[in-house]
């Protein structure tokens, strides 16, 4: 149950998809990946105020309890709701091969 | 790929399952739930240091980029990996009914 998409903190401050450019060195992949040399990494970043993009009932509970006990219960967190697949050309013991990764690039975000 | 379960921050400091007692009033459910009067809410709380319980490749990327750009990229976050179902006895327009919720109580945690 995706709840409100209106961010009360101001435009772009709440949980949403961001793109971060990263080299193989940045990612620690230089020793096993040949291509691409750079990745446009999509990830979920931003605040999760009350009921904003609440992923499920658990997220709603977390919001309620965070309001009551902020030192004990953290606010919901902005994480991927789904992923886009990506291919990497990688070195293996038997040579170079193409591998598809289904859990690498965030496609959509929610709060949980 | 669940990575290391050793917490470098000390026992109990890293991402794990916690139980928080909450009343219907705490949860904002008093007007539509009859039972239970109190819930032992299991939720995921704790830090996600490098590669601790990394849920997937995305979490590993996030760790690497957080180390490089801590002001831009947040550290991975402790969230449910799976849920335990729970039943609520709730008021409806037609009376009282039993409803099972599959996404209410965290069963297992990971970092993403």
């Amino acid at each position: 149950a995706r709840n409100g998409d209106h961010c009360p903190l101001g435009p772009g401050r709440c949980c949403r998809l961001h793109t971060v450019r990263a080299s193989l060195e940045d990612l620690g992949w230089a020793d096993w990946v040949l291509s691409p040399r750079e990745v446009q990494v999509t990830m979920c970043i931003g605040a999760c105020p009350s009921q904003f993009r609440a992923a499920n009932m658990h997220a709603q509970i977390k919001t309620s309890l965070h309001r009551l006990k902020p030192d004990t219960v953290p606010a919901p967190c902005c994480v991927p709701a789904s992923y886009n697949p990506m291919v990497l050309i990688q070195k293996t013991d038997t040579g170079v091969s193409l591998q598809t990764y289904d859990d690498l690039l965030a496609k959509d975000c929610h709060c949980i | 790929a669940r990575n290391g379960d050793h917490c470098p921050l000390g026992p109990g400091r890293c991402c794990r399952l916690h139980t928080v007692r909450a009343s219907l009033e705490d949860l904002g459910w008093a007007d539509w739930v009859l039972s239970p009067r109190e819930v032992q809410v299991t939720m995921c709380i704790g830090a996600c240091p490098s590669q601790f319980r990394a849920a997937n490749m995305h979490a590993q990327i996030k760790t690497s980029l957080h180390r490089l750009k801590p002001d831009t990229v947040p550290a991975p976050c402790c969230v449910p990996a799976s849920y335990n179902p729970m039943v609520l006895i709730q008021k409806t327009d037609t009376g009282v009914s039993l409803q099972t919720y599959d996404d209410l109580l965290a069963k297992d945690c990971h970092c993403i």
Epitope: S35, P36, Q40, N84, P85, M86, V87, L88, L98 | -
Partner: antibody, heavy 118, light 112 residues
Amino acid sequence: QITLKESGPTLVKPTQTLTLTCTFSGFSLSTYGIGVGWIRQPPGKALEWLAHIWWNDNKYYNTALKSRLTITKDTSKNQVVLTMTNMDPVDTATYYCARLAYDYVDSWGQGTLVTVSS
Amino acid sequence: DIVMTQTPLSLSVTPGQPASISCKSSKSLLHSEGITYLYWYLQKPGQSPQLLIYQMSNLVSGVPDRFSGSGSGTDFTLKISRVEAEDVGVYYCAQNLELPPTFGQGTKLEIK
């Protein structure tokens, strides 16, 4: 298993437009890093790169042929279409489509021979 | 466009003997990040080309290790340590440093 298959006319007349379709399976053109390219090989000659299209709809056309070429994709149908206008007998060749992953060209169709003749 | 020139254009080798094919590019294929964008393909009779060597020296997974690639910025060599009957066909070098990717004219390998 990855397969690509080219389809289209085997004979076209000079000045006509050639439309070739590459139908593929075993991969998705919505995957980051994936593309489909068209390459041709005139009888007894070297391979020549014509055009390619990426997952994000970025396209490349060989400069020498750019004005004659159009490449499009239909991700839901797993198809890439190449059109080439104003065909000439020198365009007689075997036309291949191939899967690309960045600079890694690992899977090719079997090719289709197109003859341009009146 | 970058011009790729192969020698010899044909080659007849006794099974079990080595074979070597040369390829020269009209411009250095060594990129500033240390990668050489040179590739070797084999087109067996009646078949489509298949990738053998990736980025000058990386053997593609599934390709027998009797094949090897080497070279510098503009001069490249494909070696077959012991030719087998299944190695017959036309070998192409190609560059992907600049668009369009360009191919050599091919070297036909026959068995004596």
